[in-house]
């Protein structure tokens, strides 16, 4: 049906056949998230009606199928500037039972009224400033927060579970007050971090190795990333101890989010969520992930359980395969990985033993090959600064900060550039922080050391003299046609 | 039976391993000598590197030497303080006590007046008193944004010990002194069993003997270029851009025959100036093939590949491209900060409509 | 990326031991289910043995009793020891690697022949 028809039906108000039209179009544009251009009058028409409607009430009986018009309506940003007013956001919230002025609705709420509301509400703060300023303004977040909270005492449906966290995700990450408000006032941390736990259904101590649901995996990511929004500007200060707590708390819960796999394909998204959070926590948190008890079947090394640091490894090999999006998919699992190498020493010689074992293909450069080490190696070439920075400072530390290590393991052509960011091109600091670290030579390496070129660090011949056979005067010569290209570039 | 030796058997065995040992160490020692050559334009960011290399000498400076810097101590310190003075103008920074101007004036006054290698108690009070203003220290946090000696804050931070009649340069002093280099720098450092020599060639021409043991057996060429340099507009005794010379050159020392075999590595320096130049300035200025998009990432490559593909011995020689900018940081979180939008972002990009 | 290589295939009399073994290579990787299969031919794979990460086995009936499945997480390989064999083991065995975020792999296969 098309939008006028619709709107012509609204105007001459018989209910049941404006009822009819709208269930029309909405099975007609259920799958529509691109309009024409040639009706967008028509449609605007037909928003401010449906507005003029929302904000004097709709009647109960048909209250879902004008919210789902509205919500097809929210998807065209040409409709945006009807549906975001004072007004319409107020009334959306209301039947959403989130508004902050009402008293709670007495009777248990229609969920699929209260779902098309969230769905409406999700679709405004997505694509539009001006209800993203409102729903700010509107504290929707305080009573979403309470709502969040009451989840271990009441039932409510897997969707408006997932609605309710993805429109605290939109909130957070387009509004910092909102992030500020849900951080502090609203002990946000807390709160999360108590429906995650519900959401895995795991108590902190038990690790089981579990496959997460579906559902359950769509709503922890929306957790993830709503913690992730909140903490991220926040965890940079110091941690009381009371934080600390709560931060390490979290943390288990990660872990085992790292340990678990998700239902469908969704593992690595899962992950990538839960590893951006981890990036998050407090330094000095981070040791729980070095926690894990040890059982039958877990990787142990010196004493410590790696499966998460595996897992972490893993994880990292799997994202570095891919070419876009670089950055944001690499930075922060090696942020996490470097932390725990510098801070934990069996952590370091795990990961060195992984990703740095002892030097035995000795003729090919450190950066070709497609072992672990070759990838991060070519990483720290790489054009985006901070994606070489991170690589090379993983490297650099897994070397025990010692830049001769650096250097053995990476070639100085390869290390040049973090030297050269940290002041270290000439050595600074002969040894790194972590004396007690040893680093064993293969017989391969021993054999070939005197060959290999420090700079490409690989064995290589060395090469006939350029320059063999000339007398005196032709090197002089060629040495000044040299000098004089050198003038001029430092002119 | 047959199998057990003597012990003068034994004994020589030792020997000729012992031998073979040395002979190998000697060969090592050799081998793991790696010289860099230095090469880069007045303002590509060379400097930079060249800070932080961390000059070891062998047995230091004597006293007599660390003496004669007194004079290079001085001058570095008021030229600091005159460059920083001018900048406050340049970058319309006022002094936080207007008493301040007078003293600025008289600064210049005294300065010009100024002994060699004497330093007045009255000038010395002048440069202090200037120091310690708060609008000078708000110009001094800018300097990069105009030319400053890097060891000004050291030696202003120092006047007191420095102003005393019997003032003696320390090895630390004459280490932070800057003089217009001219001709080669040679500058030794050591990792462990690697023994450095790099040599930072100025273009002055000195003697030329010194110039052939430069060239000789060269490990790495280190080539500094500022990105940011791309569209700077030609002076008028100039045939062509500051890029495209600093490409004709690299062309010519990447296909030197004295560095057929030389790595080099390539420092694309000033890379922030370059992000925020890329946005207004497109990069058909300097390259008027160019068909990409004017976003850092593709137009940094771009410049790479120019670079990059000047070379014509890709199979043996390598290049070792870093772009880097000053602002670089030590840590890890800084750079876990710089992502935290872009996740943001992407996990917007990623939510779809309902 | 993900390579499995088996290897303890052999002729064997019956009521001998075999010890098969598969082991991955090609990165860092976390193996969810390891399993063992086997074909004859005209016939469709069938199940032998499977573990979890976690340890937990699960066998076919025909070897209850017989072969023990096991692994090493640290070198990512599985074992099938078989004990007491029998003509009709006689079969290609394939394992079979669930790997997180890669999905399934399969060996090449190693031929078993009990005789008698």
């Known amino acids: 049906m098309e939008p006028r028809a619709v709107a012509d039906a609204l105007e001459t108000g018989e209910e049941d056949a404006v009822t009819e039209a709208l269930r029309s179009f909405n099975r007609e544009h259920s799958q529509s998230f691109t309009f024409d251009d040639a009706q967008q009058e028509d449609r605007k028409r037909l928003a401010k009606l449906l507005v003029s409607v929302l904000e004097q009430g709709l009647s109960p009986k048909h209250r879902v199928t004008w919210l789902q018009t509205i919500r097809i309506l929210s998807r065209d940003r040409s409709c945006l500037d009807s549906f975001a007013s004072r007004q319409s956001l107020h009334a959306l919230a209301c039947y959403a039972d989130i508004a902050i002025s009402e008293e709670p609705i007495p009777q248990p709420p229609d969920m699929d009224v209260l779902l098309e509301s969230l769905k409406c509400l999700c679709n405004l703060v997505l694509s539009s400033p001006t209800a993203q300023m409102l729903a700010a303004e509107a504290r929707l977040v305080v009573r979403l927060a309470e709502r969040v909270g009451l989840y271990r005492k009441r039932s409510y449906p897997h969707e408006v579970q997932f609605f309710d966290l993805r429109l605290l995700f939109l909130l957070t990450a387009l509004r910092t007050d909102v992030r500020q408000q849900l951080f502090q006032e609203l002990h946000g941390v807390r709160l999360l971090t108590d429906a995650l736990e519900l959401t895995l259904g795991v108590a902190p101590k038990e690790n089981p190795l579990v496959i997460l649901p579906a559902q359950e995996t769509e709503r922890a990511m929306e957790i993830l990333k709503v913690l992730f929004n909140i903490t991220y500007d926040s965890v940079k200060r110091e941690v009381d101890e009371e934080d600390a707590a709560l931060y390490r708390y979290l943390g288990t819960l990660l872990r085992h989010c790292v340990m678990a796999d998700a239902a469908g394909d969704r593992t690595e998204e899962f992950h990538g969520h839960t590893v951006n959070l981890l990036g998050n926590l407090p330094l000095k948190c981070l040791d729980v992930l070095l926690a894990l008890e040890l059982h039958e079947g877990s990787l142990e090394f010196m004493g410590v359980n790696m499966d998460v640091i595996n897992a972490l490894l893993a994880f990292l090999e799997k994202r570095l395969h891919q070419t876009h999006r670089l950055k944001e998919c690499v930075a922060p699992v090696l942020s996490v990985l470097t932390e725990c190498a510098r801070m934990h020493r069996p952590a370091r010689k795990f990961l060195k033993a992984q990703v740095l074992p002892p030097l035995r293909d000795v003729r090919t450069r450190p950066e070709v090959g497609d072992l672990l080490r070759n990838k991060l190696v070519r990483l720290m070439t790489h054009l985006d600064t901070d994606v070489k920075r991170v690589a090379a400072e993983f490297l650099f530390v897994l070397c025990s900060e010692s830049v001769p290590r650096f250097i053995k393991y990476t070639g100085y052509g390869n290390a040049a550039g973090l030297l050269a960011a940290r002041g270290l091109m000439a050595g600074g600091r002969p040894e790194g922080q972590y004396s007690e670290d040893e680093d064993t030579d293969t017989e391969e390496y021993r054999e070939a050391k005197a060959s290999i070129n420090p700079v490409t660090g690989r064995v290589e011949e060395k090469p006939p003299n350029p320059m063999e056979g000339m007398t005196e005067e032709q090197k002089e010569h060629e040495a000044m046609k040299l000098v004089n290209m050198f003038d001029k570039l430092s002119r | 039976m047959g199998c057990t030796l003597s012990a003068e058997d034994k004994a020589a065995v030792e020997r000729s391993k012992m031998i073979d040992r040395n002979l190998r160490e000697d060969g090592e020692k050799a081998a793991r000598e790696v010289k860099l050559l230095l090469l880069g334009a007045g303002e590509s960011g060379k400097s930079t590197i060249v800070k932080q290399m961390k000059i070891i000498h062998e047995a230091g400076y004597s006293e007599e030497e660390c003496k004669q810097y007194k004079a290079v101590v001085y001058s570095n310190t008021i030229q600091s303080i005159i460059a920083i003075i001018r900048a406050m103008g340049r970058l319309k920074i006022d002094f936080g006590d207007a008493a301040r101007a007078d003293d600025a004036r008289q600064l210049f006054v005294l300065a010009g007046a100024a002994e060699e290698g004497f330093m007045t108690a009255e000038l010395a009070g002048v440069i202090k008193r200037l120091w310690k203003d708060s609008g000078v220290q708000a110009c001094f946090n800018r300097s990069r944004e105009y030319q400053l000696n890097d060891s000004a804050a050291y030696y202003l931070n120092d006047l007191d010990r420095i102003a005393q009649p019997n003032y003696i340069p320390t090895q630390q002093d004459v280490l932070r002194t800057r003089v217009k280099t001219t001709g080669i720098v040679e500058t030794h450092f050591t990792f462990k069993d690697l023994h450095f020599k790099m040599f930072d060639v100025g273009g002055q021409r000195s003697e030329r003997k010194k110039w052939i043991h430069c060239f000789e057996g060269v490990t790495a060429i280190i080539f500094c270029v500022a990105l940011s340099d791309y569209d700077l507009v030609l002076a008028e005794d100039e045939e062509m851009n500051r890029m495209h010379e600093s490409m004709k050159l690299f062309d010519s020392i990447c296909n030197n025959k004295w560095f057929t075999d030389t790595s080099i590595i390539l420092f694309l320096n000033k890379k922030d100036l370059f992000e925020e130049k890329i946005k207004k300035s497109p990069l058909t200025i300097c390259y008027p093939e160019y068909a990409g998009s004017n976003t850092y990432e593709e137009a940094a490559a771009y410049i790479q590949c120019q670079f990059e593909d000047l070379n014509k011995r890709k199979d043996t020689k390598e290049i070792y491209t870093h772009f880097t900018c000053a602002t670089d940081t030590k840590n890890v979180q800084f750079v876990f900060d710089a992502v935290t939008d872009v996740i943001i972002k992407n996990n917007l990009k990623d939510c779809g409509l309902f | 990326q993900v390579q499995l290589v088996e290897s303890g295939g052999d002729l064997v009399q019956a009521g001998g031991s075999l010890r098969l073994s598969c082991a991955a290579s090609?990165?860092?990787?976390?193996?969810?289910?390891m399993g063992w299969y086997r074909q004859t031919p005209g016939n469709q794979r069938e199940l032998v043995a499977e573990i979890t990460r976690a340890g937990n086995s699960n066998y076919a009936d025909s070897v209850k009793g017989r072969f023990t499945i096991s692994r090493d997480n640290a070198k990512n390989t599985v074992y099938l020891q078989m004990n007491r064999l029998k003509p009709e083991d006689t079969a290609v065995y394939y394992c079979?690697?669930?790997?997180?975020?890669?999905?399934?792999?399969w060996g090449q296969g190693t031929q078993v022949t009990v005789s008698s």
């Open positions: 079979n690697f669930n790997v997180r975020y890669y999905g399934e792999y």
């Open positions: 090609g990165g860092i990787f976390i193996i969810n289910n």
